[in-house]
């Protein structure tokens, strides 16, 4: 009864196609697969950024896999060959691991890389990123931003930099077609005649950094003697109504402050006949149904009612 053995995959490597963190892991079939002609071997691939506690695990019949990584750190990966149950009478047969690593040799000291990188996708339309120069870098230092997402043939450089004192401190992006709900990769590198500059890599998804416009057309409607309905409209732009959460601040007679978070463009407020003045403001944010995170809009213009008209049916301003 001969022991079944299988070799690890050959030529296991991590290839960087220049997509700022989206890497290819590829390998060749193991030697001596002839004994297993009736079996479809599978490969168990494990990979992670160095320093991460957990491995990502994939099982595939293919000879390649692609995923995104943080190029600020190194990458380690390992792979072995698995034989399916049908070929092994139920016992596990797997090869030894083939292992590989990848990292970008860092230039410059960490302090030279950009500081406080901040990116906002305004109203799900306009992406703007800003940063501060590295610590202790000279004025001759300039930073360049490159970006890539799936759908672009290659990484692109920013063409509309925001400048301060002749230095690039931000980027206004062009229209980014079909760029949400996928990883968006950025590299900010730099050059200086004085000393090498450390590159920085960032990855995010655009729908998670949206800052909407504030709601518009705030109105009051008297529903009953003790209820007033506050209404507003979604801001102009591409964000559908189903994607919004709202926060309202209501001030009654300069004293009572009510805050509430709602999912619709209305809020019903209990009032008394003694109420002489009512003001409210609203702000919006993309909700959990459309993103994992978001940024609150600015507050809307304040809408107020003053005087006797609160007993009337509709109050518009």
């Amino acid at each position: 009864d001969t022991e079944i053995k299988v070799n690890p995959p050959q030529d296991f490597e991590i290839v960087d196609p220049g997509y700022l963190g989206y890497l290819y892991l590829q390998w060749q079939p193991p030697l001596s697969l002839d004994h297993f002609k009736e079996c479809t071997v599978e490969y168990e691939l494990k990979y992670r950024n160095i320093g991460s506690e957990t491995w990502k695990t994939i099982i595939t019949k293919n000879l390649h896999y692609k995923d995104g990584f943080d190029l600020n750190k190194g990458i380690e990966a390992k792979i072995h060959t698995l034989l399916p149950w049908q070929c092994t009478n139920g016992s596990e047969v797997q090869s030894s691991w083939a292992e590989t690593t990848y990292w970008i040799s860092p230039q410059g000291i960490p302090e030279t890389k950009v500081q406080d990188m901040d990116c906002v996708y305004y109203n799900w339309q306009y992406l703007l990123c800003s940063w501060k120069p590295g610590i202790g870098v000279l004025l001759d230092t300039n930073y360049n931003l490159f970006y890539w997402y799936e759908g672009l043939d290659h990484a692109l450089q920013c063409v509309d930099y925001i400048k301060a004192d002749g230095q690039n401190i931000g980027c206004r992006f062009p229209y980014l077609e079909a760029s949400d709900y996928k990883d968006f990769y950025i590299c900010v590198n730099g050059s200086s005649e004085n000393k090498p500059i450390r590159s920085s890599y960032f990855t995010f998804q655009l729908q998670n950094i949206v800052k909407p416009l504030p709601p518009v057309y705030l109105t009051f409607t008297r529903e009953s003697s003790c209820e007033i309905k506050l209404k507003w409209s979604i801001p102009l732009g591409p964000i559908p109504a189903r994607c919004f959460d709202y926060e309202i601040e209501i001030r009654e007679d300069d004293t009572t402050l009510v805050t509430a978070t709602v999912e619709n463009e209305t809020y019903t407020l209990k009032t008394t006949n003694e109420t002489r003045q009512l003001c409210f403001v609203v702000r919006s944010k993309v909700n959990i149904y459309c993103s994992d995170d978001g940024i609150w809009s600015e507050w809307s213009d304040k809408q107020c009612w003053e005087g006797e008209d609160l007993s009337k049916k509709t109050l518009l301003r």
Epitope: E42, I59, L82, L83, P84, W85, Q86, C87, T88, N89, G90, S91, E92, V93, Q94
Partner: nanobody
């Protein structure tokens, strides 16, 4: 006949819950590690959670704190309790026997999470 059979998939709103089951038959279930994998748009199956024959569990970072794997060696069944589901959890979910047993796949069960 050696077999793994998943059940419990379905459609759910984002934020909802589902519990998947995988019944094993035809082999000594208790000695095998078991895993839940999923396949979305890609051909590859990614490990979601696994449980060794001694009950040790590991989870992919994307599901930590939301999914729980468990096993019942009397019923020869492994479970995946999925809470706070997200649209990106939409996939076909497969259970698989793991080491020290050979690799054996179930047929899969579809999970669809809509916003």
């Amino acid at each position: 006949q050696v077999k793994l059979e998943e059940s419990g998939g379905g459609s759910v709103q984002a934020g909802g819950s589902l519990k998947l089951s995988c019944a094993a038959s035809g082999y000594n279930f208790s000695k095998c590690g078991m895993g839940w994998f999923r396949r979305a748009l890609r051909e590859e199956r990614e490990l979601v959670a696994e449980i060794s024959n001694d009950g040790t569990t590991t989870y992919d970072d994307s599901v930590k704190g939301r999914f729980t794997i468990s096993r019942d060696n009397v019923k020869n069944t492994v479970y995946l309790q999925m809470n706070n589901l997200k649209t990106e959890d939409t996939a076909v979910y497969y259970c698989a026997s793991r080491n020290p047993c050979g690799l054996l796949w179930g047929q899969g069960t579809q999970v669809t999470v809509s916003s």
